[in-house]
């Protein structure tokens, strides 16, 4: 069974998948479609790296540009380094600028909805 066939079989169970499962899935060459990706739990998507999302979505990663104003895509973009976003070749903006550190202050983020940044 190839990755695409595997994805079709598990698609209906993915809604509540935790980050760890999504990271594992990104190694399976599943090419998740964007509609399914956007139904995932936001808290499960946010920790994924650009490389992991790229592997998870495969060719459908191109659609992030078309859906950049919608959650969880918008929130995920805000969490990524701009340099990493640039590798997607989509002109996505809003990532963390080069030279900034991301502080994992859970309370701060819970209140504001965005990560706390420490400038250069």
């Amino acid at each position: 069974m190839n990755g695409s066939e595997y994805f079709v079989k598990i698609q209906s169970f993915l809604g509540g998948a935790p980050t760890e499962d999504l990271k594992a899935l990104s190694q399976q060459n599943v090419s998740m479609d964007l509609a399914t990706f956007m139904k995932l739990r936001t808290d499960a998507v946010l920790p994924l790296t650009v490389a992991e999302v790229q592997k998870l979505l495969g060719p459908h990663v191109e659609g992030l540009k078309a859906e950049e104003r919608h959650r969880p895509v918008r929130d995920w973009i805000l969490r990524q380094r701009q340099d990493d976003l640039d590798t997607l070749g989509l002109g996505l903006q809003g990532g963390i600028p080069n030279g900034y550190l991301v502080l994992d202050l859970s309370m701060q983020e819970a209140l504001s909805g965005t990560p706390c940044l420490l400038g250069p």
Epitope: S31, L34, A35, E62, G63, A66, E67, L88, L90, G91
Partner: antibody, heavy 117, light 113 residues
Framework: EVQLVQSGAEVKKPGASVKVSCKAS????????MHWVRQAPGQGLEWMGN????????YYNERFMSRVTMTVDKSTSTVYMELSSLRSEDTAVYYC??????????WGQGTLVTVSS | DIVMTQSPDSLAVSLGERATINCKSS????????????LAWYQQKPGQSPKLLIY???TRESGVPDRFSGSGSGTDFTLTISSLQAEDVAVYYC?????????FGGGTKVEIK
């Protein structure tokens, strides 16, 4: 103004390979994916695959998986599509098309590839 | 693969009259989160490259005359030319960009009656 200029028509023998180029201008080349679509004479459109011009990552329609290779040259803002093991049914016009998000917003003029012995 | 079925194959309409083209997909093209339908319409005039008319099923590409409109959701979509002009003679294709391989309908040829 966005422009996609493709290489000229080619005549190839069965079993040979063809490499079609698509030179882009008028926009930031690395910000938009490129797709390849072909159209056999008098027929409809068939998606072959797409390529990320920033990283060079490419994805192919499984129908062409073993025969197609898409590459990019960022220095010249050019994308290439090579199709190998040509057969008569590969005779078609091959188009490059720049993505607009997912849809194909701008198309090249097309390159006619004729496969004939 | 998602199968796109267009109807009719060809259509002859008088100048100034309405032309309606249908497109049906074998599975939903709706993103239920964003409410976007991943469907585009293209126009291909004789001897020319295809040209984008509509994306997200109903969003008109800039520069496209407002006599062209798209509608529908899920699996059933329609392209309407409200008042056919001579320059609208072409083949029209729908395309799904929901899941690869992105697939096109077989095309609808629009002619003047």
């Amino acid at each position: 103004e966005v422009q996609l200029v493709q290489s000229g028509a080619e005549v190839k023998k069965p079993g040979a390979s063809v490499k079609v180029s698509c030179k882009a201008s008028g926009y930031t080349f690395t910000n938009y994916w490129m797709h390849w679509v072909r159209q056999a004479p008098g027929q409809g459109l068939e998606w072959m695959g797409n390529i990320n011009p920033s990283s060079g990552d490419s994805y192919y329609n499984e129908r062409f998986m073993s025969r197609v290779t898409m590459t990019v040259d960022k220095s010249t803002s050019t994308v290439y599509m090579e199709l190998s093991s040509l057969r008569s049914e590969d005779t078609a016009v091959y188009y490059c098309a720049r993505s607009g998000g997912l849809w194909l917003a701008f198309w090249g003029q097309g390159t006619l590839v004729t496969v004939s012995s | 693969d998602i199968v796109m079925t267009q109807s009719p194959d060809s259509l002859a309409v008088s100048l100034g009259e309405r032309a309606t083209i249908n497109c049906k997909s074998s599975q939903t093209l709706l993103n239920s989160v964003s409410q976007n339908n991943y469907l585009a319409w293209y126009q291909q005039k004789p001897g020319q490259s295809p040209k984008l008319l509509i994306y997200f099923a109903s969003t008109r590409e800039s520069g496209v005359p407002d006599r062209f409109s798209g509608s529908g959701s899920g699996t059933d979509f329609t392209l309407t030319i409200s008042s056919l002009q001579a320059e609208d003679v072409a083949v029209y294709y729908c395309q799904q960009h929901y899941r690869t391989p992105y697939t096109f309908g077989g095309g609808t040829k629009v002619e003047i009656k």
